[in-house]
């Protein structure tokens, strides 16, 4: 006899970035039928849904319109069908973003680089906080962090084409509480014409757009946006 | 403490060729990165050319592309800088760097004058 259904989906739209005072609706997909959906923030329960009809339904919505520092933080949601609730998701971490500073991005030895060299990007924030991190932006999430009193380096080593692409970073000031991205950096590396093909980078986006793209946990969702998987989400843990 | 010497500077005509030279106090072999950067007249520093020391892998800023040719020599622990096809556009101060580790310019000389004109 089973006694848990399979856990849910949960993932944030447009993004788990969210800067601060903008909207961002946490999402969790269950199975049809489920009569109550429960959101968990942190431990305790959040908010609370029940789809109507509920066998036509298999995704709910909770929204918050306005982001901030108390808003961020972990969430797992939970469903039922009848009397039996399901495991929980996977945790979803909620970050505010454009929190108090603006931090310098800048690459060494510079933007532009030969396959092969050893490249490192340095992120450099002059107030209260000791841990960055770098973002690749893309398909797939590339995230690194880096720790420093008002800077943070971040050696790629040597690189190879797949390096290439638009990076920002952020200054912390806890796992959650990020600081506004810095001016994006784009990172051009050229290959040995005669012995490496030069591969496309990965999509990126517009800076207008930045933040504007899907995090999940669930690397099995497939949604009609750009999909980053989980690894942003595990190295904040 | 280590010191970088540029010297090979100096007045060219257009289109004729010059060699920099670039002596330094310590061991090379070890350093990650040399490279030649240059600045012109009322213009901010730019990266003309370097070289990474274990792999050979040179990069040339476009401008000097096919022009330029950077080449270093570990036993005399001296970084060179072979320019021919010479253009009004190359005249700069132009200085030596070394970057022992692959993350920062460590050391810079103090530069040498070349000036084409005709």
């Known amino acids: 006899q089973q006694q848990t259904l399979p856990k849910p989906f949960i993932w944030a739209e447009p993004h788990f970035m969210v800067p601060k005072e903008k909207q961002v609706t946490i999402c969790c997909q269950g199975n049809y039928g489920a009569v109550e959906y429960q959101l968990h923030f942190e431990g305790s329960l959040f908010a609370v849904d029940r789809p109507k009809p509920p066998e036509r339904i298999n995704k709910v919505q909770f929204y918050i319109p306005d982001m901030n520092s108390r808003m961020a933080g972990q969430y797992s949601c939970i469903y039922r069908v009848g009397e039996l609730w399901s495991e929980p998701s996977n945790l979803l971490d909620l970050v505010v973003t454009e929190m108090y500073d603006t931090p310098t991005l800048s690459v060494h030895p510079g933007p532009e680089v030969i396959s092969g060299e050893k490249v490192t990007f340095y992120c450099r924030l002059d107030t209260a906080t000791s841990m960055f991190l770098l973002l690749k932006e893309g398909r797939s999430s590339h995230v690194q962090r880096g720790y420093g009193k008002v800077q943070a380096e971040f050696p790629l080593g040597p690189v190879t084409t797949a390096h290439r692409g638009t990076y920002r970073c952020f200054g912390s000031y806890n796992n959650h509480a990020w600081s506004f991205p810095s001016e994006p950096v784009k990172l051009l590396v050229t290959g040995d014409i005669e012995n490496t093909s030069l591969a496309p980078e990965d999509p990126t986006f517009p800076a207008d757009t930045w933040g504007t793209y899907l995090l999940t946990t669930e690397t099995g969702l497939q949604k009609d946006h750009a999909l980053w998987d989980h690894t942003a989400q595990n190295l904040l843990r | 403490d280590v010191q970088l010497v540029e010297s090979g500077g100096g007045v060219v005509q257009p289109g004729r060729s010059l060699r920099l030279s670039c002596a330094a106090s310590?061991?090379?072999?070890?350093?990650?990165?040399m490279g030649w950067f240059r600045q012109a007249p009322g213009k901010g520093r730019e990266v003309v050319a370097r070289?990474?020391?274990?792999?050979?892998?040179?990069y040339y800023a476009g401008s000097v592309k096919g022009r330029f040719t950077i080449s270093r020599d570990n036993s005399k622990n001296t970084l060179y800088l072979q320019m021919s096809s010479l253009r009004a556009e190359d005249t700069a101060v132009y200085y030596c760097?070394?970057?022992?580790?692959?993350?920062?310019?460590?050391?810079w000389g103090q530069g040498t004058l070349v000036t084409v004109s005709s």
């Open positions: 760097a070394a970057d022992r580790t692959g993350a920062t310019w460590d050391y």
């Open positions: 310590g061991r090379t072999e070890s350093w990650y990165r």
């Open positions: 070289i990474s020391g274990d792999t050979n892998i040179k």
